[in-house]
């Protein structure tokens, strides 16, 4: 099921910035999603549940995000993603077991100065 | 600002079910959003922050949801919203003060058996 997740639209424009969507299987209950920009961790979001099923969300890098039951979207200013960078979603699944780590969708993003053109130069599922 | 929130599309189709979107001001940091179906509380989502700014989300009625910085969307199966029901988003604002309770957008939803037609019979902002 994880292999199917690359077939979604990873980049879109959102309020003058870029939305980067990282999809994951709906069965995943607890996870860590990291967004890499080239080799640097740009965003790091962890969702866990306690024994009372309360959700705890850790966002140590304070990335603007949106979380649903099958995706994490990170919102970047254009400045964060200019000059052409390779973005990669990396997923760690804590629950359900077994523990898994997967590199999900990846893509090369180039934003022209016009801020109107978002070109995927390379698409690596 | 709260009065402007009714002017959004409350209902939309999503994966064969219905997405009900309850918008709130972006300034709100901690809140409870309840979705009423007629007079019954169908969904109840509370977002609070702890001392380390960690987000805690309580969803005691286990509704599928999506949370962003200005909206809570609940996802219902068509069965949940057939036969015509009035849906209402009710917001409690904990932070920033002062504490406020507001009924936001409300609408009457009827889904025909074809599951292709979503008709808003009544729209009460």
């Amino acid at each position: 099921e994880l292999n199917d997740l690359a077939n979604h639209r990873m980049f879109s424009f959102h309020d003058g910035g870029v939305q980067i969507s990282c999809n994951y299987p709906e069965t995943v209950q607890q996870l860590k999603m990291q967004l890499f920009k080239d080799r640097e961790v740009l965003c790091d979001l962890t969702k866990t549940k306690g024994s009372g099923n309360t959700v705890s969300i850790k966002n140590p890098m304070s990335c603007p995000y949106q979380l649903s039951n099958n995706s994490v979207s990170f919102f970047l200013d254009n400045a964060d993603s200019s000059q052409g960078s390779y973005f990669l979603c990396s997923l760690s699944i804590f629950d359900p077991p077994p523990f898994q780590e997967k590199n999900l969708s990846g893509g090369y993003l180039l934003i022209y100065e016009s801020q109107l053109c978002c070109q995927l130069k390379l698409w690596l599922p | 600002e709260l009065n402007d929130l009714a002017n959004h599309r409350m209902f939309s189709f999503h994966d064969g079910g219905v997405q009900i979107s309850c918008n709130y001001p972006e300034t709100v940091q901690q809140l409870k959003m309840q979705l009423f179906k007629d007079r019954e509380v169908l969904c109840d989502l509370t977002k609070t922050k702890g001392s380390g700014n960690t987000v805690s989300i309580k969803n005691p009625m286990s509704c599928p949801y999506q949370l962003s910085n200005n909206s809570v969307s609940f996802f219902l199966d068509n069965a949940d919203s057939s036969q015509g029901s009035y849906f209402l988003c009710s917001l409690s604002i904990f932070d920033p003060p002062p504490f406020q309770e507001k009924n936001l957008s409300g609408g009457y939803l009827l889904i025909y058996e074809s599951q292709l037609c979503c008709q808003l019979k009544l729209w009460l902002p």
């Epitope: 069965t27 209950q29 309360t54 | 960690t54």
Partner: antibody, heavy 117, light 111 residues
Framework: EVQLVESGGGLVKPGGSLKLSCAAS????????MDWVRQAPGKGLEWVGN????????EYSPFVKGRFTISRDNVKNTLYLQMNSVKSEDTATYYC??????????WGQGTLVTVSS | DIVMTQSPSSLAVSAGDRVTINCKSS??????????LTWYQQKTGQAPKLLIF???TRHTGVPDRFMGSGSGTDFTLTINSFQTEDLGDYYC?????????FGPGTKLELR
Amino acid sequence: EVQLVESGGGLVKPGGSLKLSCAASGFTFSDYWMDWVRQAPGKGLEWVGNIDEDGSIAEYSPFVKGRFTISRDNVKNTLYLQMNSVKSEDTATYYCSRWGRFAFDSWGQGTLVTVSS
Amino acid sequence: DIVMTQSPSSLAVSAGDRVTINCKSSQSLLSGSFNYLTWYQQKTGQAPKLLIFYASTRHTGVPDRFMGSGSGTDFTLTINSFQTEDLGDYYCHHHYNAPPTFGPGTKLELR
């Protein structure tokens, strides 16, 4: 190997206070929610409360809410239970447990707290 | 709060017996495709140990004679071919919501 070692139990008078500790080793302490579970002599298990990975969320059983406080020190890899206004019904063995995402997968040996005048 | 009940409260068993312990919750523990129901074993003088999580998944190292089954509100722990080292108390536990609660326990004693 995961190890949890409780300490601080003993005899305490009704209305008194006691602080229990749980030293954790063998895993990345700051990655896990942690819980306290107690067991009165000859009785079953009862959940006391929990705390999330960085200590910003804590939840409590209705039986101890307002009297007990759970905290943690991720530098010292230690979990704490501060017990105030104790009652005779708080007499129990108190276990520290790691919430392994979907179950209590590791437990300490327990420390006995006796509330008596 | 969700109330967990177990039956029987105690059971006299012999080596080789097939043992069945029942657990019932006051509301469904099914969320999505998961039942938030766990089984623990506690031997005399020891801390509890995890046996089964998500109603039917055996924890690492747990012998395959232990089997969990059930869904919704009714669950069963089965020990196929009971061994004397299986003596002790068995507890079901839910983590569907707060507060998580345990069943009252089932004590297995030698016949």
